[in-house]
């Protein structure tokens, strides 16, 4: 969370951003909120990116003003127009690219003053893993697959019964480049699996951490997975 204060004539307004991460090829959101104004005509929102000459996005007098928008963002940005009046200046970024990573500034002007705050935006690829029993293998084996990751993540196996055990000797992880030559498919195999135990496949890079759990008993198999974005700290 980053809170910035303006330095206007009347008084500064508080602008708040939250560091976030974008999944390449998908749509992302750069979060920014500010002290609301009661009239739309006086609200100006400017999004800028460090190292980029043109604007990322500008909204003023109730409309998008894109004459000074940088080419790299053309057709890819939008504010939540209906939410501007209640202090939401968040930016929707379509088709996130690796090159969208960097430091952004959310700059706000209202009839009450000015303010801005920076936001660190990371880009990469992350996806939910799925853990299955590999019936093709000669011994009891689990297979953990996640279709899209970048940068290359680490994969760690854990088990509920053998807490703290190191499974690196009995697992094998491979990374297969996807067709767009950036993201990779993650496949990790765990051997010598015992019944009546819960195993977790944890995939992590500097952007996200995802876990796929599988509980194997003689009568059933239960699966669960979740993904968590690792937001960078406020500067």
């Amino acid at each position: 969370l980053i809170i910035g204060f303006g330095i206007s004539g009347r008084h500064s307004i508080t602008v708040t951003t939250v560091a976030s991460a974008g999944n390449i090829g998908e749509d992302g959101i750069l979060s920014c909120t500010f002290e609301p104004d009661i009239k739309l005509s006086d609200i100006v929102i400017q999004w800028l990116k460090e190292g980029v000459l043109g604007l990322v996005h500008e909204f003023k007098e109730g409309k998008d003003e894109l004459s000074e928008q940088d080419e790299m963002f053309r057709g890819r940005t939008a504010v939540f127009a209906d939410q501007v009046i209640v202090g939401n200046a968040s930016l929707r970024l379509k088709n996130v690219q690796l090159t969208d990573a960097g430091t952004y500034k959310c700059y706000i002007i209202t009839s009450k003053g000015k303010g801005n705050a920076n936001l660190e935006y990371k880009t990469g690829a992350f996806s939910m893993p799925e853990v299955n029993v590999d019936y093709n293998a000669s011994s009891e084996t689990l297979r953990c697959e996640a279709p899209r990751w970048f940068p290359q993540p680490t994969v760690v196996w854990a088990s509920q019964v053998d807490q703290g055990a190191n499974f690196s000797e009995v697992s094998n992880t491979s990374f297969e480049l996807n067709s767009e030559n950036v993201t990779m498919k993650v496949v990790s195999v765990l051997y010598n699996v015992t019944i009546n135990n819960t195993y977790s496949c944890m995939i992590e890079n500097d952007i996200a951490k995802a876990t796929g759990d599988i509980k194997v008993t003689e009568s059933e198999i239960k699966r669960r997975s979740h993904l968590q974005l690792l937001n960078s700290k406020a500067s």
């Epitope: 002290e35 609301p36 009239k39 109730g62 202090g87």
Partner: antibody, heavy 117, light 107 residues
Framework: QVQLVQSGAEVKKPGASVKVSCKAS????????MHWVRQAPGQGLEWIAA????????DYNQKFKGKAKITAVTSTSTVYMELSSLRSEDTAVYYC??????????WGQGTMVTVSS | EIVMTQSPATLSLSPGERATLTCKAS??????VAWYQQKPGQAPKLLIS???YRYTGVPDRFSGSGSGTDFTLTISSLEPEDFAVYYC?????????FGGGTKVEIK
């Protein structure tokens, strides 16, 4: 859930003053504007003024400057509107309304102010 | 100030019919228009915000459209509970202003 509870009906003589209250609950009181709107009997809606409790910024309809004064007490999440030099034309229902997720998405039940000699 | 003119003043229709209410701003207000429904003895209720965004819990027979100076509230098929007074309001500039209202009554 968001609730705005207003004070009860008032009957005042011409030239007197009245102070109407609006107590908010269910949201962060200091983060959203609170407005006052009035409606004379059988008439339409008229915006009076607004206050941002976070820093006590106010905005008034020029027509009501000198007539209405709004204040906010953050410790009780209450907004007050004082109307002075009352005249019969000030007879109306006065509503408080706030803008949390959308414009005027929550309203108080209204306070009837009757000015009569 | 921005004047919001609603028409017609009264609309007499039967349940099941389509209602079209219009609101014209005296100057460009972008999309900064909301629509409210008011029944006798009650506070107004928000129906549509920012010209076309249906508020939470509002039936989908209500829809809003328009930008700039011309705005429309449409009720696709009137239900008995829809007979009320409807107001448009602009939040583009201060003073915030409302239209004079359109009364939708049973024919």
């Amino acid at each position: 859930q968001v609730q705005l509870v207003q004070s009860g009906a008032e009957v005042k003589k011409p030239g007197a003053s009245v102070k109407v209250s609006c107590k908010a609950s269910g949201y962060t009181f200091t983060s959203y504007w609170m407005h006052w709107v009035r409606q004379a009997p059988g008439q339409g809606l008229e915006w009076i003024a607004a206050i941002y409790p976070g820093n006590s910024d106010t905005d008034y309809n020029q027509k009501f400057k000198g007539k209405a004064k709004i204040t906010a007490v953050t410790s009780t999440s209450t907004v007050y509107m004082e109307l002075s030099s009352l005249r019969s034309e000030d007879t109306a229902v006065y509503y408080c309304t706030t803008t949390v997720a959308h414009y005027f998405d929550y309203w108080g039940q209204g306070t009837m102010v009757t000015v009569s000699s | 100030e921005i004047v919001m003119t609603q028409s017609p003043a009264t609309l007499s229709l039967s349940p099941g019919e389509r209602a079209t209410l219009t609101c014209k701003a005296s100057q460009d207000v972008s999309f900064a228009v909301a629509w409210y429904q008011q029944k006798p003895g009650q506070a107004p209720k928000l129906l549509i915000s920012s010209a076309s965004y249906r508020y939470t819990g509002v039936p989908d027979r209500f829809s809003g459209s328009g930008s700039g100076t011309d705005f429309t509230l449409t009720i696709s098929s009137l239900e008995p509970e829809d007979f009320a007074v409807y107001y448009c309001q602009q939040h583009y500039n201060t003073p915030l202003t409302f239209g004079g209202g359109t009364k939708v009554e049973i024919k």
